[in-house]
């Protein structure tokens, strides 16, 4: 039986103020059943980031198209980056639920500093 | 080719039971969910239950009567039903699911069902 | 529950003819909706899913459209293969999956 791996390959994401950062997360199951949603940091106090189902991210796209079928790509772009989105982002899936979705499983993160400006 | 096919119906007596299974071929089963909708003679569709990987969804009206399950192994859907009553009459249909996008499931193949009928 | 509405009940039509069908929501279901159609003695196909997407094989004179609780299944020039049972789904909040009532195609 396949166990769903939650894949981010990049442990450390060095971007530039005023551009775009690509968060990757890909999946090897679409099981079980649920969504796929990202956040800044762990705990209660954790930030959402991106909810595909319900939301206004009015800076954040998704990489894959959202009409393709069978999808286990959630990445994300994170568009005009500021100091204040340092920190660690998960992708985090989710079992569904009645009527609250439970939390199955977290990627390892990918943490998002600052890098260096261009000369 | 994505093929299912389904097999146990039959005539059943009122408290009865039945098991039913869809043999699946032609997709990676053991990473879909796969569900159970009926149509009972005459009228519309009706979903009665999906499985993921070990988690179970049930339409109310055979929530503890019913248990779906599956056998990644043998590529094979089951469905066993106790309990039966008159209302359960109908074509059980077997049916993969597929999601668009991040989440949300429908179904993109059916099997040709098998008839349950419960009758005294 | 989220309840689906479909009209009309049947539509008699002539082959070549423009079909409109209507399904409509309870409540918003986003653009969470796929069209299946279902011919005397058969299982059900799918046509359309997330309300606009043609499932592969399907032929183009099928087109879906709307958002929140208002959708259409439009076929552009009837053809007598086309007749038969058209059925909408809602895939935004389950369980329960939910299905139209149904509505009939049938030759005038």
């Known amino acids: 039986e396949e166990e769903l791996q939650m894949i981010q390959p990049e442990k450390l994401l060095l971007v530039t103020v005023g551009k775009t950062a690509t968060l990757h997360c890909t999946v090897t199951s679409l099981l079980p059943v649920g969504p796929v949603l990202w956040f800044r940091g762990v705990g209660p106090g954790r930030e959402l980031i991106y909810n595909q189902k319900e939301g206004h991210f009015p800076r954040v796209t998704t990489v894959s198209d959202l009409t393709k079928r069978n999808n286990m790509d959630f990445s994300i772009r994170i568009s005009s980056i500021t100091p204040a989105d340092v920190g660690t982002y998960y992708c985090v899936k989710f079992r569904k639920g009645s009527p609250e979705n439970v939390e199955f499983k977290s990627g390892p993160g990918t943490e998002m500093a600052l890098g260096a400006k261009p000369s | 080719e994505v093929q299912l096919v389904e097999s146990g119906g039959g005539v059943v007596q009122p408290g009865g039971s039945l098991r039913l299974s869809c043999a699946a071929s032609g997709f990676s089963f053991s990473i879909y969910a796969v569900s159970w909708v009926r149509q009972a003679p005459g009228k519309g569709l009706e979903w009665v239950s999906t499985i993921g990987a070990d988690d179970t969804y049930y339409a109310d009206s055979v929530k503890g009567r019913f248990t779906i399950s599956r056998d990644n192994s043998k590529n094979t859907l089951y469905l066993q039903m106790n309990s039966l009553r008159a209302e359960d009459t109908a074509v059980y249909y077997c049916?993969?699911?597929?999601?668009?996008?991040?989440?949300?499931?429908?179904?993109?193949?059916w099997g040709q069902g098998t008839l349950v009928t419960v009758s005294s | 529950e989220i309840v689906l509405t479909q009209s009309p009940a049947t539509l008699s039509v002539s082959p070549g003819e423009r079909v409109t069908l209507s399904c409509r929501a309870s409540q918003n279901v986003r653009s969470d909706i796929a069209w299946y159609q279902q011919k005397p003695g058969q299982a059900p196909r799918l046509l359309i899913y997330a309300a606009s997407s043609r499932d592969t094989g399907i032929p183009a004179r099928f087109s879906g459209s709307g958002s929140g609780t208002d959708f259409t299944l439009t076929i552009s020039s009837l053809q007598s293969e086309d007749f038969g049972v058209y059925y909408c789904q809602q895939y935004y909040d389950w369980p329960p999956f939910t299905f139209g009532g149904g509505t009939k195609v049938e030759i005038k």
């Open positions: 049916a993969k699911d597929s999601t668009v996008g991040w989440s949300g499931d429908f179904f993109d193949y």
